[in-house]
Interface confidence: low
Amino acid sequence: DAEFRHDSGYEVHHQKLVFFAEDVGSNKGAIIGLMVGGVVIA
């Protein structure tokens, strides 16, 4: 599992919010969907 930068930005991609991450071979580890209170929960 790759670590994520806390200051990561995000973009909409295929109807999923995907956080920019370092050294992540797949977007799956960063798929979130909903961010509330600074915490990605879905």
Partner: antibody, heavy 125, light 106 residues
Amino acid sequence: EVQLLESGGGLVQPGGSLRLSCAASGFDFGPSPMWWVRQAPGKGLEWVSVIGKDTQNSTYADSVKGRFTISRDNSKDTLYLQMNSLKAEDTAVYYCAREWMDHSRPYYYYGMDVWGQGTLVTVSS
Amino acid sequence: SYELTQPPSVSVSPGQTASITCSGHNLEDKFTSWYQQKSGQSPVLVIYRDDKRPSGIPERFSASNSGHTATLTISGAQATDEADYYCSSQDTVTRVFGGGTKLTVL
């Protein structure tokens, strides 16, 4: 012991209101995203609403949008669900649940790892 | 909205292997979790992030997620495993549950 305890359910007439509470204990409630999930009699699970650590950040299922309001009081370690304009189809057991978070990897999805015992809401005349 | 489809029921003999499927469009692109709900009780998380077991969940519970289908496998099913099982995944802005599968251990 990590625990969630719901209260506030009961019998209410269509168009009425109820406020559900969920008291948390045994974990750091403040940063934890929290869910309300319901289950109609003999039916499956349906998410209702979710809230993050900031009470201004929440979302709702279309079926309850504009009628239900989720909130939390982190000083009391308590989650709430204000339900207005209740309908017969809102009859269900309502569960609160904690979103499991690995705080070292805050952008990961895990699941709802702690659930309350549920409180029954019956909407009937 | 995104939908997850499960068979309504699955039967298994004690000691045998039970497989419960959960289907959704390009499901492998999403993380899937599984919940066990015994009669009259609250749901319990048994699998998260496709194939990981929370502490306290027996090793006989395993899962996979490939293509359009996630599968929960219970190896050496026991009478205590009789329950409803729900798959769950993320939708665009929230969480979605499958309709549930009733596992009967005959």
